[in-house]
Structures are given as C-alpha cells and as structure tokens.
Interface confidence: low
C-alpha cells in the first residue's frame, strides 16, 4: 500500500479544528514581479517580505517596491514601506541581514543615474525603523557584515574600490583600489586580491592577494600570481599560476596567509578548475577537474593541514567552473555526504560515503520500491537521489537534498530507484538513519520542510495546478495527513520556514488568480496545537549512529567514536520545543585501519581497507612541500583521518623528517611576501 | 446571504437509523466546516461531530464516535448526518451550522449560520 | 474532552442591569471560545467569537473577555430582547458546549 496509507497509521486527533483554529492569510495588496523574503534574528518571529515589479519604459525600467514585516512569524504582516520613503529596492542585492541576532539589515536602493553614489537603508532595531544613507559610491556587491562585528560592512564599488565601515554604513572608506575579490576571514581580517594593470579579468593568474588586519589601516601581501582565492574552515587556500606555463596549482595556508605550503594536489591547466566542496576545521573535500569538457573530476580529502590528499572518488559529476555538483553534507549525521559520479555509459549514479569521504558506496534500494527500467537486475539495484544536476537539467525536481542537524538522522530527498537517475518523474524518499536505509515516503515531486526538529515534516505536492492542501507528518514520514489551507487554491511559489527547524510554524506562499485581480497570498499554519504537550522522558529512545552489525563491539564506530542519541519515538506527537538540544553521548572505539586515510602516494583499491603503493611513485622517495622547505615522508601508507578521535589499537608508523631544502615548487615562500601600511 | 436548509421531521423507532440533510444555499459551501449539534428537550446544546466539505474528513465527539456518520456533497453544497441505533434519549432538536467566516482559509469564528433544526422523534 | 461549566445556571435580572456570565474551561483552550444566545424554539445565534471578537451585527453590550481557562461573557445594559439561554462552546480539539445559563426576568 502506499506510504501513510496502512492501517497502522493513526490519525491525529481533531487536526482539523486545531489547524484551523492556526491557520492565517495574508493578502498582499497587489502583485509585484517578484517575491524575496528573508528572516531577522534567530527566534524573534520577524520576516521581512519585499515585492519588486519592474516596468519596462521604452528607454528605461522604472521600479516599484513594497516592503512588508512580520513579527509573528508570518501570521500577519505590516506594510513598512513607508519607513524606506517608498524607495525601490534592488532585489540583485537582496536584503541583507546581520549575522546572529544583531537585528541588523541594509537594504539597497536604486538610485537615478547621475547620482554621485548609491543609497542603502539601514535598520539595527529588525527592521522596525530605518536610517537612510547615501553613500560615496556605486556599490557592486551586497554589504558584507564582519562575522565578528556586525558594525563592521564591506562592499565593492563599480570602480573596483573596496569601501570598509566601522559604524554599520553610516560612514564609508575606500580603503584599496583595484579590488577584484574581498572576504571577510576570522578576527576582522580582510582577504582581497588585487589586480595591477588592466582589469580583474586581464590580470586573472597575475593578481595580488593582500590581507588588512586593522580594516584598512595596514596592509600585507601575502600571495601573489594569484588566479583566484577561497576560505573553508580555517584554511586559506590560493589557485596559484606556475611559473613557466598555463597550469595553476592550490596552495594552503592555516595561519591567515603568514606562511604557504602547496597543496599535494593535481595542477590544472586554463579550461579546469579547483572547487572546495566543504570544509570544516579538520579538513577539506576538493574538486579537481579533469582535463577537457568531461563534467566530471576527482573528490580530494585533506589531512588535518589541509596539504596532503587523498583520491577520494572518481568521475565526480561536476558540469563546469560555477556549473552544478550534486555533493551535499548530510548535517543530519557526522562524516554523511551524498553525491553523484557519471559513469562510463554517461549514466549518473548516486555515491553515499558515511566516514567522511572514506569510502563511497551505492546507496541501498528502498525495501517498498521496485528496480525502474534503468535496472539490468530487477532485484538488483540502487536509490540515486537528484540534486542540483537534476534541478538545472529542469527535470521535474522541485528540491534538493534535505537534512538539518537538529533533526538527527533525517535525510529527505527527491530518487529514483534503478542503475542510475531516472528522467522519469521522481518519488521523495526518507532515511531515518543519516542515510543508510532509504524509505518511498510520497508518491511524486514534493517541497518538503523539517519543522521542530524533526517533529514535524511537511510536504506540498508539486503541481503545476493550483494547489490546497498541505500534508504533514508526525512519525517522520511513515503516515500522512492532509489538510485543506484553503477554500480557493493558489498558485504555490514556495515553502518558507525559519532556517534552523525549530520552529513550528510553515508559511506556503503563492498568488491567486481571478478574473481581474493577480495577489500574492501567503497561509502561515502553525502545528503548535497539532504536537499538544511538551516532550518528555518517554517520548525519546536511545539511537546508536552508524550502527550497522549489532553484534560487533566496534558497531557505530565512525572516525574513531560512536554516538548514542536520544531521540523522539516516532510515535511520540508532542513538542520538542524551540530549546531543543540534540542529546548525544559519545564514546571512543579503538582504532582500524579504517580510521586511516592512504597517506600521500598511496590508495586504497575498491572494496579493501589496506592502503598500497600508487604503482607511479612505487621505489621513490616521497618528499613534498611544506611551508617553503621540502619534507621527506617514512609511512607504511596510512595517516589518520582528521577528526578522528580513536585511540589504542591498530598504530601504523608515519614520520615525517625535515630536508633542510628550499622548495623550488613553492610560489608562495614567504620571503616573497611583504607589508605596507596607509 | 448563505442559509442551511434541513430535512424535515423525522419519527423513528428504537434501533433503526435517521439520516438528516442539510442544504446550503446562497454561498460558497466547501471550504466551511459544518457541525451537526443536538438538542434534547429542555436540555442544552450538544456537539456531535462536524465536517469541512472540501477535506471530506469528518470527526465526531467521542459520545457519538461509531454510531454517527457525517458526510458532504460538494455538487449538491448538502451535508448529511445519519445517526444509527437510535434509541429514546436520541429523542431531539439536530441542527446543522456553519463554522469559518474568511474566504480563503479556514478560522475557527464559530457557528455564524445555523438552520432551523430538524426534529427526531424516536419512539416505540 | 475538555468540560465548560457556566455558571449560575440561571440569572435573574431586570432590563438595564449589568449581566456576567461565567464559563471555565477544565484545562486551558486559550481563546478559542464562542458564547451564543438562544431563544425558545429557534436556532442558537452567535454572539462572540475567539473569546472577545464581536460578531458583525450583534449589539456593543455583549462584549467577552478571558483566556485560558476563565471567560467571561458580559452585558453592559440589559434590554428586554436579551431574556434568552446562553451557551459557551470551546473549539480547541473537539467541541463542547458549557451547560448554559438562562437569563430570567426579575
């Protein structure tokens, strides 16, 4: 029988009324071109919703926007635009919030063309007041908040000037000329490259990267022959152009730049590209793309300093520079990412690796779901999950990949079950186990959310018809229960819920359509009285992560330690509330070689845990670059993987000794670096 | 103006079943709930269940849960109660109303239109 | 299933007079509280709405008030139209009605 629809599945009780009785509209007042809504703070109930319609006039477009605020979560909203002088926003630049709870926000405004700069609106209240500011410059790119100071903003002006703000935009200092990049790194640090003669795009693999540490006030170049520059975790890293010909290398720092090592990674030439698929501060997933057009590359794993790598998997599916990657870190389970190689046939399949890039495997076929045509075997095959890849390919995909961290376990995603991704039209699948095992929760396409940390899942239908009715479940998808939001069905635009999962409420936007009137509407329906009592002790279970052989002592053991989770019984409909902490309980397991990445020159062939000899570098010295003077390494093939934490056990030899040699390979060796003040 | 129009009186005997209808007129009649309540004589209001046309799901109070059944038909805008094993006690005053007042979603704003009842007379 | 006792049960009083009718709810419904009227022989009628809200076309004197478990149904003058039973109806879960309470010329 279909999902939800078995007699085991109990009805919740008298939903209707209580989701009736929490059931608001919103009727905007007019139908703009576009919709952009984005949350202020973290609990504070405060959406700010902004419409944009553009009219085309024969020489130019005129603008008009409306701002709205909720403080409700989206029950009821406020039109506010009175408060930016009814100025018309651009939507290229978005709103942009401050970071944590600052209650900060900066809004763009268009301004006419002989203006001597541009104008924002700023609001460190969330958004209940505005100042307005005209700036000494057109700005190129949203205002960016420091991590650390939300007073802090950066921008890019058409001129190529990086403009620096101590007092949250109030006043503005160009503080360098000729900027092409600038982030923000940690401690208010500022990362910029900088090109010398014609422009970003003539000088590209000839630019400077410079930091200031004092917001403008000093200066250090700490890389040059710079091709392009990226921050993950606490790692630098710099595409850097070789000296004598077109190829470009990535070189690592984890001291802001003061000092290089080179990355023991493959150099790639004009038409390829470096991409960090994530990083965390252990280490780092790269991209290294192949040669010519193929649309696939390598995943690269870093040790703890970002140097040395290990081939993680090949025939990465990754179409272009800035193209599409299905790769998603499952954060709803440690060292899960989920994503898809093409293979030889040009078929793309799904990979899932459990141990941080480790090991990929298949994903397993759903126990409810039958092989499509795409299977060879009938009774043999896999779920191969669409993400970004599927969604630019404008297959019938209407999300990617879901999971949340506060919701352990919960992977939501759109599949299909065969050899290989199916064009045919998808199902949404659920794994309550970080990925694991796989089960069909709803027939067709479907936007999905997380609410209350996995309390609640809610689904819309993905139809090009108006829509009605919003399904929800209490027991992580097992059992479905529909409800009518509405008499009149709208055309459904989007989801919206607070980033996080905590909370309990789901707004479904869209507009109506009738004979003479076109209006954005928006339902807030919050599930409050649906999950009526708090959780308690009962309610929730203990989980063992990554368990896979009960019997096994080491069962569990993922990057040297198990965790026990509490979690909430899927039969338990009660609230977990906004202060929900994810209760887990970890422990240390004994080391394998399963902890141990192959070390540089070595790999592990498929479906062995032994590392051996990469056959090219069989009989040489392995010597590599670190920090400008060349190492030599002694390892029988293994180094530990970062953020494992196991200890005793298997201890394979790694020593690591000091040639006294400069590198000659090292682009970046600091005495090439230098400093200057304003 | 929306207005309910209920079947008309009914004599029934202990153990037999009474079906009541309820016909909105005037008004859209889908996305509004509609509640059956009951009156004995000389008693007070008593809910019995209700249903929301369009969802076609109905829930019943627990005094009732198995012996009433609540249903809509959207093409005829009519709802129905059938109440089975009747006995004396069910001897009553059935009303049909009209919950929910915003078109376009669902509130609960109470029971703002009501018809003029249906009496069941259950006897020997 | 939530209980709504009203209290008194019966009211006598005389026109003009200021009126409060009492309903408890035995666990909290927060305001999802309507109070009707009802005449001998008709259908009941709605007064209030969500605890406080006025239903449109029914006279200023009625007015509600409470939440949770406590509510509280007022009229400020009593007119001679007004000598009718009156009910309360919860509407969180399933929906009960309280006992009434049947206002009485003194």
């Known amino acids: 029988s279909a999902p939800g629809e078995d007699e085991e599945c109990g009805r919740v009780r008298d939903f209707v009324a209580k989701l009736a009785n929490n059931t608001h509209q919103h009727v905007f007042d007019d139908l703009r071109g576009s919709v952009s809504l984005s949350w202020v703070g973290d609990s504070t109930g405060v959406i700010l919703v902004l419409t944009t319609f553009h009219v085309p006039l024969v020489i130019m477009t005129f603008g008009q926007s409306k701002l709205y605020r909720s403080e409700d979560y989206g029950k009821n909203f406020k039109d506010i635009t009175d408060l930016i002088n009814n100025t018309f926003i651009r939507t290229e630049f978005g709103m942009a919030i401050g970071p944590e709870n600052s209650g900060k926000v900066v809004l763009t405004a268009e301004v006419s063309g002989g203006s001597r700069g541009g104008r924002i609106f700023r609001s460190s209240d969330f958004a209940k007041n505005f100042v307005q500011t005209d700036l000494p410059f057109h700005p190129l790119t949203q205002m960016m908040y420091s991590p650390q100071n939300s007073d802090y903003l950066l921008a890019l002006s058409t001129e190529n000037g990086l403009w620096v703000s101590k007092n949250f935009g109030g006043k503005w200092e160009e503080i360098h000329k000729a900027v092409c990049l600038a982030k923000w790194g940690s401690d208010n640090t500022i990362f910029f490259t900088t090109y010398a003669n014609g422009s970003c795009k003539a000088d590209l693999g000839a630019l400077e990267l410079w930091r200031t540490s004092d917001l403008g006030k000093s200066f250090k170049t700490i890389g040059v022959k710079i091709y392009s520059f990226g921050l993950g975790g606490r790692f630098l890293f710099a595409s850097v152009m070789a000296d004598k010909d077109t190829t470009r290398r990535i070189h690592v720092s984890t001291d802001q730049g003061d000092t290089w090592s080179m990355a023991q990674l493959p150099s790639v030439g004009q038409e390829q590209f470096y991409s960090i698929l994530a990083a965390n501060d252990d280490m780092v997933f790269m991209h290294v793309d192949e040669p010519g057009d193929t649309g696939f590359g390598t995943i690269f794993t870093s040790d703890d300093r970002g140097i040395v790598y290990s081939k993680s998997l090949d025939r990465h599916l990754y179409t272009t520079t800035g193209g599409e990657t299905d790769f998603t870190n499952v954060t709803s389970l440690r060292g899960v990412y989920i994503t898809s190689v093409l293979s030889e046939d040009n078929s793309i399949q799904t990979m899932i690796t459990f141990d941080q890039g480790g090991r990929w495997t298949h994903l397993r076929k759903p126990e409810n779901s039958e092989c499509d045509a795409t299977a060879k075997n009938k009774n043999e095959c896999s779920l191969h999950i669409h993400a970004s890849y599927s969604i630019s390919q404008k297959l019938n995909v209407p999300m990617a990949p879901l999971s949340e961290p506060n919701a352990v376990g919960i992977v939501i995603a759109h599949g299909s079950v065969g050899d290989a991704i199916s064009v045919m039209v998808p199902d949404v699948y659920i794994s309550d186990d970080g990925g694991y095992s796989w089960t069909k929760m709803l027939e067709g396409p479907h936007y999905y959310t997380i609410l209350d940390s996995g309390g609640i899942i809610v689904a819309i239908e993905h139809s090009s018809r108006p829509i009605n009715v919003i399904k929800f479940s209490t027991d992580e998808g097992q059992c479905w229960q529909t409800y009518t939001f509405t008499r009149d069905p709208i055309y459904f635009t989007g989801l919206a819920s607070e980033p996080g999962a905590r909370s309990m409420n789901i707004s479904i936007w869209g507009f109506t359509e009738s004979f003479l009137t076109s209006q954005w509407v928006s339902y807030t329906i919050d599930f409050k009285d649906i999950l009526e009592r708090n959780c308690e002790e009962k309610d929730y279970t203990i989980w063992l992560a990554h368990s896979t052989d009960p019997e096994d002592y080491e069962d569990g053991c993922i990057l040297g330690y198990k965790e026990q989770f509490l979690r909430l019984r899927k039969s338990s409909v009660c609230q977990n509330g906004r202060d929900y902490v994810v209760t887990k309980q970890p422990s240390i397991c004994l080391c394998s070689l399963e902890d141990f990445l192959c070390d540089f020159g070595y790999y592990r062939p498929e479906n062995d845990s032994k590392c051996v000899e990469q056959p090219e570098l069989k009989g040489h010295d392995l010597e590599f670059c670190l920090y400008g003077r060349e190492e030599h390494l002694t390892t029988n093939g293994y180094r530990k993987i970062p953020g494992d934490k196991c200890q005793g056990g298997v201890n394979p030899v790694r020593e690591v000794k000091d040639l006294k040699k400069k590198c000659t390979s090292n682009f970046l060796s600091p005495e090439k670096q230098n400093s200057k003040s304003n | 103006q929306v207005q309910l129009v209920q079947s008309g009186a009914e004599v029934k005997k202990p153990g037999s079943s009474v079906k009541v209808s309820c016909k909105a007129s005037g008004g859209t009649f889908s996305s509004y709930a509609i509640s059956w309540v009951r009156q004995a004589p000389g008693q007070g209001l008593e809910w019995m269940g209700g249903i929301i046309p369009s969802f076609g799901t109905a829930s019943y109070a627990q005094k009732f849960q198995g012996r009433v059944t609540i249903t809509a038909d959207e093409s005829t805008s009519t709802a129905y109660m059938e109440l089975s094993s009747l006995r004396s006690e069910d001897t009553a005053v059935y009303y049909c109303?009209?919950?929910?007042?915003?078109?376009?979603?669902?509130?609960?704003?109470?029971?703002?239109?009501w018809g003029q009842g249906t009496t069941v007379t259950v006897s020997s | 299933d939530i209980q709504m006792t009203q209290s008194p049960s019966t009211l006598s009083a005389s026109v003009g007079d200021r009126v409060t009718i009492t309903c408890r709810a035995s666990?909290?419904?927060?305001?999802?509280l309507a109070w009707y009227q009802q005449k001998p022989g008709k259908a009941p009628k709605l007064l209030i709405y969500?605890?406080?809200s006025l239903e449109s076309g029914v006279p200023s004197r009625f007015s509600g008030s409470g939440s949770g478990t406590e509510f509280t149904l007022t009229i400020s003058s009593l007119q001679p139209d007004d000598f009718a039973t009156y009910y309360c109806?919860?509407?969180?879960?399933?929906?009960?009605f309280g006992g009434g309470t049947k206002v009485e010329i003194k």
């Open positions: 969500k605890a406080s």
């Open positions: 666990q909290s419904i927060s305001s999802w």
């Open positions: 109806q919860q509407a969180d879960g399933h929906i009960t």
């Open positions: 109303a009209r919950q929910g007042r915003k078109t376009g979603y669902y509130y609960y704003y109470g029971m703002d239109v």
